[in-house]
């Protein structure tokens, strides 16, 4: 799990806009974006 | 260990398609898929991805909600495509993180 | 939204030579570091070669190398062979962005 600032902010932010069980979200947190960069 | 995607052909404008990312031979929670698409001769375009671990999503803003990523299964993620136009045309790809990559499949949206 | 710009869009290079592509973010990437370079065959899907910027991916040739940070980047093959015939795109992650993900044009390398 990711726990820093900004993994935090980013799940807030996703569950803020939870649709239908599914996050609209366009900040890929650091524990995704950076496995793949 | 594999990625590979299946779905595509040939669709209407204005229809709708749904992509399926098959993975083998890894951990699936552990990971993030991606989706990146090509469009003929063009370059890659991120379209989303979705982690795995929790099955949050996250999408670039051109989608606009007319594509959405699922996990269906504990090896396959879905990519529903709706509101197809001519301009999404494209080998759709599903990645591991990036670093293990599916053949693609290809979606021709064409009347 | 994070813009990557990749340059030259095609480079001829004889085999044996040195080939540079450059990589250029409109913003810092994640860590400073947060880029990948991938090698596309026509008919194939991408492979990625190089990830934190210079982190050589498992079973990739040496001759393969990134440097870089921040928001200037770029892959060095050093002694060119036939079979580096391919385009190479690089992409590039920041996290407090939306569209914090995106991917440059593309390089196409032919060996001569």
């Known amino acids: 799990a990711c726990d820093t600032a900004t993994c935090v902010t980013h799940r807030l932010a996703g569950l803020l806009s939870r649709s239908g069980g599914v996050v609209k979200n366009n900040f890929v947190p650091t524990n995704v974006g950076s496995k793949a960069f | 260990q594999s990625v590979e995607e299946s779905g595509g052909g040939l669709v209407q404008p204005e229809g709708s398609l749904t992509l399926t990312c098959t993975a083998s031979g890894f951990d699936f929670s552990s990971n993030a898929m991606w989706w990146v698409r090509q469009a003929p001769g063009k370059g890659l375009e991120w379209i989303g991805c979705i982690y795995n671990g929790d099955g949050s999503t996250y999408y670039a803003s051109w989608v606009n909600g007319r594509f959405s990523i699922s996990k269906t299964s504990s090896t396959t993620v879905t990519l529903q495509l709706n509101s197809l136009t001519v301009a999404d045309t494209a080998t759709y790809y599903c990645?591991?993180?990036?670093?293990?990559w599916g053949p693609g499949t290809l979606v021709t949206v064409s009347s | 939204a994070i813009v990557m710009t990749q340059t030259p869009s095609s480079k001829s290079v004889p085999v044996g030579d040195t080939v540079t592509i450059n990589c250029q973010a409109s913003?810092?990437?994640?860590?400073?570091?947060?880029l990948a370079w991938f090698q596309q065959k026509p008919g194939q899907p991408p492979k990625r070669l190089i990830y934190d910027a210079s982190k050589l991916a498992s079973g990739v040739p040496s001759r393969f190398s990134g440097g870089g940070s921040g928001t200037q980047f770029t892959l060095t093959i050093s002694g060119v062979q036939c079979d580096d015939a391919a385009t190479y795109y690089c992409g590039g992650y920041r996290s407090d962005s939306v569209d914090g993900v995106a991917f440059a044009g593309g390089t196409e390398v032919v060996v001569k």
């Open positions: 990645a591991r993180d990036l670093d293990l």
């Open positions: 913003e810092s990437l994640y860590n400073n570091n947060a």
